[in-house]
Interface confidence: low
């Protein structure tokens, strides 16, 4: 009976050993599968995150497009109204003009002498820009960049005058130090009778026939 028990015990030990090995193998297999599943989960997760990011970006882009469309529709209907009303009243800015504080501004990308720039603005039912405040100055500078740009200020007929009749003496001024100086040393004949923004935004007087960029301005009528 003892020998039988010994055999049974040996058999049990063997079975247990086999079971342990088998269990370890299964655990290892499960662990490998788990890692694989984990990796796949991470992959799916990152794909989902990317898709979500893309969707958010698409949504933002779509919102921008919708806003732009709404703005364009408003602008177009306003243009149509202005067109039907023979352009006598303007409650919105023409296309490609920028609205700021009740005025519309157009920034040239080409260059012309002051007189030609002035004529151009007049043909657009506007005038060369008249700068009346520090805020307007900053707004213009943000849109122009560091470029010499004509403004609607000249002393060709005597004292300095704004083209729209705004009072020069009591109004906003932003000359560079020692300007205007009516400099004759340029050798182009005469002095300097037209004002422009210099690269840092302060004003200088220069020879009117120099070709610089320019800005046109027109006031918006109050909407009823």
């Amino acid at each position: 009976q003892n020998s039988q028990l010994r055999e049974d015990l040996l058999a049990l030990r063997q079975n247990f050993s086999n079971l342990t090995v088998s269990t370890e193998d299964q655990v290892k297999a499960l662990s490998t599968q788990g890692s694989s599943v984990g990796r796949k989960m991470k992959l799916v997760e990152s794909k989902l995150e990317k898709q979500q990011k893309d969707l958010t970006e698409d949504h933002s882009s779509l919102l921008l497009h919708v806003k732009q469309l709404v703005s364009d529709v408003r602008s177009l209907s306003c243009q149509m109204a202005a067109f039907r009303g023979n352009g006598s009243e303007r409650t919105c800015c023409p296309i490609n003009w920028v609205e700021y504080e009740g005025s519309c501004y157009w920034f040239s990308s080409s260059v012309r002498p002051w007189t030609e720039a002035d004529k151009y603005c007049q043909l657009e039912n506007a005038h060369l820009v008249v700068v009346t405040s520090r805020d307007e100055q900053n707004f213009l500078q943000r849109h122009m960049g560091p470029l010499n740009t004509w403004i609607g200020l000249t002393d060709q007929n005597g004292p300095w005058k704004w083209v729209d009749g705004t009072d020069y003496e009591t109004g906003f001024q932003n000359w560079r130090p020692e300007q205007p100086d009516n400099w004759y040393g340029h050798g182009l004949g005469g002095g300097e009778d037209c004002a422009h923004f210099t690269t840092d935004g302060r004003w200088n007087d220069d020879v009117c026939r120099r070709p610089y960029r320019w800005v046109c301005e027109t006031k918006l009528d109050k909407a009823n």
């Epitope: 500078q141 943000r142 470029l147 560079r176 210099t198 690269t199 840092d200 935004g201």
Partner: nanobody, 121 residues
Framework: EVQLLESGGGLVQPGGSLRLSCAAS????????MGWVRQAPGKGLEWVSD????????YYADSVKGRFTISRDNSKNTLYLQMNSLRAEDTAVYYC??????????????WGQGTLVTVSS
């Protein structure tokens, strides 16, 4: 990367002269107006002079007019400040500065490390 490196500072007697230089790199030098600004010990920044991109137009603070001359050599990307008839009150750290062409009430966007000018007997 914009870099402005001043040199030429030092100790000088009243009535003496110095020439400051500023070597510029990292941007198209001849596209921008440049200037000099100084800071005396315990004082705020004081605009000294600036010069247009071409070098045609130059501007000076009243305190240095007739004594200082700003100039530039666009072929060497270098800005200069010739200082004559120096006075004790000219003692300061002198900074070379690039004008940003954007906001008139803060016209400088890059500054050098500065060079110290001491006027003393």
């Amino acid at each position: 990367e914009v870099q402005l490196l001043e040199s030429g500072g030092g100790l000088v007697q009243p009535g003496g002269s110095l020439r400051l230089s500023c070597a510029a790199s990292g941007f198209t030098f001849n596209d921008y107006d440049m200037g000099w600004v100084r800071q005396a010990p315990g004082k705020g920044l004081e605009w000294v002079s600036d010069i247009s991109s071409t070098g045609r137009a130059t501007y000076y603070a009243d305190s240095v007019k007739g004594r200082f001359t700003i100039s530039r050599d666009n072929s060497k990307n270098t800005l200069y400040l010739q200082m004559n008839s120096l006075r004790a009150e000219d003692t300061a750290v002198y900074y070379c500065a690039k004008m940003n062409g954007k906001y008139y009430d803060d016209p400088f966007d890059y500054w050098g490390q500065g060079t110290l000018v001491t006027v003393s007997s």
